[in-house]
Interface confidence: low
């Protein structure tokens, strides 16, 4: 049987002669040269050679465990004379022994990491990893220990894990943002003679909100004319904040001062400035100076830094209102006046009043804007503002007159203002009622007495307060001996009724009825209208067949045969 132990060979042999591996030996070998040893398998005849007589194996080249740690070969022993094997072919292993010939190599040449500023000591930053190609199962050639070469006292590294942590309290980004840390990985458990590699870790402190906003000055002063409309920007204030991004966002607000209701502050999103704007109309004559307390605050506050103090700052803003020569101001925004339509020329309707609001109290003169009163129906006393008529009025022509009055400062004609005047013309009963339409009707020759042949309606241009109340009657000259009667329905209508049985169209073909229509207002107005009644031949249903004259233009009469 074969006689050998496992073969071991040290890697990276540097000797000048071949490296002895070991001896293949069969217990059948009597040492007389009758046996021949043959080697086959991994590297046989090239890397490994065998003395076929003695079985001694040598390595011809320097071997690298990291390239190939194990070689598997086969051994044969044969009888030189017969060529027959004296041992079964057997597999054996040459194991390459490790030496510490590889330094640790980091997975990255440069690491990049971030950690919030002001982090607690021991806060995780990043983990670095180095690998060593040597044999981890044998000795300490691959046992890596991490240490920090550069970056203390700010950061530390855990020797076994490569975890980098913060090592100093209160690291402030606003003081220093970037750190370059150099980490060494050393094998042999960090002992003397170990091989080492290094890597660079670039660490950036990210911002936290640890700085409040600060106004660079405690007082600001701005001026604005009293004429500034609401929304007008007056000035800009800016607080600075050493933080960045959303931690540097600033919100401005007015927290106190007499101008609290008069002014606003808007945050300009782009510039992070506070824009002071006018909120309500200013009046130099009422108040010339306002003082505001404006606050700048961080909307995104981190509770853990509240101990550093309030994340806000205040400044005083003084606003000086500048005087502007203002136009006169009317006592009302608009005036509504009324006058009867029968008013005589020069009748006073009412008056307007305007005053210069400035301290000078310049006198004012009044005038009518003639573009709004082209017909010069009204006039105004330039001194006292009294409005009076200069022409006769007619409500039925125009109910409302809309005119504009101008008030002008006598000493400064450029300063003027305008006010609308709405003048309502009140109704007077100055129009008579009249027929609503032209009435022409017919009566059948065989009509019976008291038949309704036409209903009358009236209209009136006036507009009495309690509504129209018309009365209808035959004119006095036609009332006696008339062939028809008028029946007043007391509802502003009246009916024409036949007064006799039968009409002869050959005797009288047409009747003209004068009807008096009166209103019941003061003074009473009345008019006379004429109704034409034609006598016609009718069928037994009372339908008109023929009349003495031409065919009726308006056959509006009611059937009388019924």
């Amino acid at each position: 049987s074969w006689m050998w132990n496992q073969f071991f060979l040290l890697e990276e042999y540097t000797g000048s002669d071949y490296q002895y591996v070991g001896k293949l030996h069969s217990d059948q070998d009597r040492g007389d040269g009758s046996l021949k040893y043959i080697l086959s398998g991994d590297g046989a005849g090239d890397l490994f050679i065998i003395n076929e007589n003695t079985g001694d194996i040598q390595a011809t080249k320097r071997l690298d465990r990291e390239e190939k740690p194990v070689y598997i070969l086969r051994a044969q022993a044969i009888n030189r004379r017969t060529g027959r094997p004296v041992e079964p072919e057997s597999e054996f292993i040459i194991k390459i022994h490790d030496i510490n010939d590889n330094e640790p190599i980091f997975t990255k040449e440069v690491y990049t990491a971030t950690v919030p500023e002001m982090s607690d000591v021991g806060t995780f930053v990043v983990q670095v990893t180095a690998t060593d190609a040597d044999d981890p199962t044998y000795g300490n050639s691959a046992k890596v220990v991490y240490s920090i070469l550069q970056g203390q006292p700010y950061f530390s590294v855990e020797s076994e894990t490569g975890i980098i942590k913060t090592a100093l309290l209160n690291m402030d980004r606003e003081n220093r943002e970037q750190y370059q840390v150099v980490i060494q990985a050393k094998d042999m458990g960090g002992q003397m003679g170990g091989l080492s590699g290094t890597t660079t870790v670039n660490i950036t402190l990210t911002d936290v909100n640890d700085n409040p906003p600060r106004f660079p000055q405690s007082t600001y002063q701005f001026k604005t004319p009293e004429s500034s409309p609401p929304g007008t920007p007056i000035g800009r204030i800016k607080a600075s904040d050493a933080d960045v991004g959303e931690n540097a966002e600033i919100e401005y607000s007015i927290t106190d001062g007499e101008g609290l209701d008069m002014f606003d502050v808007i945050t300009d999103q782009e510039t992070q400035e506070g824009i002071i704007t006018v909120k309500k109309l200013l009046d130099f004559e009422k108040k010339k100076v306002y003082t505001l307390k404006v606050e700048a605050s961080n909307p995104h506050v981190e509770p853990r830094f509240l101990y550093l103090g309030p994340f806000k700052d205040s400044a005083t803003v003084r606003i000086v209102v500048e005087d502007v020569d203002e136009p006169p101001v009317f006592s009302k925004l608009a005036y509504i006046l009324q006058i009867r339509e029968d008013a005589q020329i020069n009748t006073t309707i009412g008056s307007v009043t305007a005053q210069d609001p400035d301290a000078a109290r310049n006198p004012v003169k009044y005038s009518v804007d003639r573009h709004t009163d082209m017909d010069r129906i009204f006039n105004i006393d330039s001194g006292n503002g009294s409005i009076f008529t200069s022409k006769l009025l007619d409500r039925e022509t125009l109910l409302w007159h809309n005119i504009t009055v101008i008030a002008t400062e006598i000493n400064n004609p450029k300063q003027s203002s305008r006010v609308p005047l709405y003048i309502k013309v009140l109704d007077v009963n100055d129009n008579a009622p009249e027929f609503a339409e032209f009435y022409e009707t017919f009566v059948c020759e065989k009509a019976k007495a008291d038949q309704l042949i036409q209903t009358l309606r009236a209209v009136d241009k006036d507009d009495p307060y309690s509504g129209h109340q018309f009365s209808f009657s035959l004119a006095p000259e036609a009332a006696s001996g008339s062939n028809f009667t008028i029946q007043d329905n007391k509802d502003n209508t009246a009916g024409i009724l036949t007064r006799k049985n039968g009409y002869n169209r050959h005797e009288m073909s047409t009747y003209l009825l004068p009807v008096v229509i009166s209103d019941n207002d003061y003074p009473v107005q009345s008019s006379t209208g004429t109704v034409t009644v034609r006598v016609c031949a009718c069928d037994h249903h009372g339908n008109m067949q023929s009349c003495h004259a031409e065919a009726l233009i308006h056959p509006t009469g009611l059937s009388t045969g019924a």
Epitope: T206, G245, E246, E249, E251, Q269, E270, P299
Partner: antibody, heavy 120, light 106 residues
């Protein structure tokens, strides 16, 4: 003037992927956080996710229904925002808007939207 | 997650009417409440931010109020162009929207 223009929408099968873009102009793009918002047909608005600015470390945050499937990125040199949508589901069908996030956590400018339809 | 509940979900009103929409948060949101208007086929438009601040260019008939959990959007005199859907949005803890209020013509 400020403008946001979305593109890249279209029809995709369930399980598929799509990449939306949002091109910005008229403002300093790199200084602003930008959000993606979506609106399913006939439904209300739903926040998808956002990416902060360079000054805030390009932090991203996502709504629960899309976390792990959608990724927001940006290229400040091109003034462009991206939304990479993977493992799409039928319930992701919506008009997708990008919107500029202003201070005080409101969205002052929006794009016109791009329609994404997920259907087999 | 913070839930936002808007009421009513829809309302009918006439031009000139005063309209009020309310929004309630499931927990306090420190005034980080925004209101948006959206018209069909269009992107939402910011009206009010931080509960009561009028966005630049928005008519003054729109106003917002409230703090903590209860907020209100008021349109003092409804105009024809105001018929739209209105959404509230909280920005205190990530973002969530109300379900919307549709303002229709009566």
């Amino acid at each position: 003037q400020v403008q946001l223009v979305e593109s890249g929408g279209g029809l995709v099968k369930p399980g598929g992927s799509l990449r939306l873009s949002c091109a910005a102009s008229g403002f300093t793009f790199s200084s602003y956080a930008i959000s993606w918002v979506r609106q399913a047909p006939g439904k209300g608005l739903e926040w998808v996710g956002f990416i902060k600015s360079n000054a805030d470390g390009y932090t991203t945050n996502y709504a629960a229904p899309v976390k792990g499937r959608f990724t927001i990125s940006r290229d400040d040199s091109k003034n462009t925002l991206y939304l990479q949508m993977n493992s799409l589901k039928t319930e992701d069908t919506a008009v997708y808007y990008c919107a500029r996030i202003r201070y005080f956590r409101n969205w002052d400018y929006w794009g016109q939207g791009t329609l994404v339809t997920v259907s087999s | 997650d913070i839930q936002m509940t808007q009421s009513p979900s829809s309302l009918s009103a006439s031009v000139g009417d005063r309209v009020t929409i309310t929004c309630r948060a499931s927990q306090t949101i420190n005034s980080y409440l925004n209101w948006y208007q959206q018209k069909p086929g269009k992107a939402p438009k910011l009206l009010i931010y931080r509960a009561s601040n009028l966005q630049s260019g928005v008519p003054s008939r729109f106003s917002g109020s409230g703090s903590g959990t209860d907020f209100t959007l008021t349109i003092s005199s409804l105009q024809p162009e105001d018929f739209a859907t209105y959404y509230c949005q909280q920005g205190d803890s990530s973002w969530t929207f109300g379900q919307g209020t549709k303002v229709e013509i009566k």
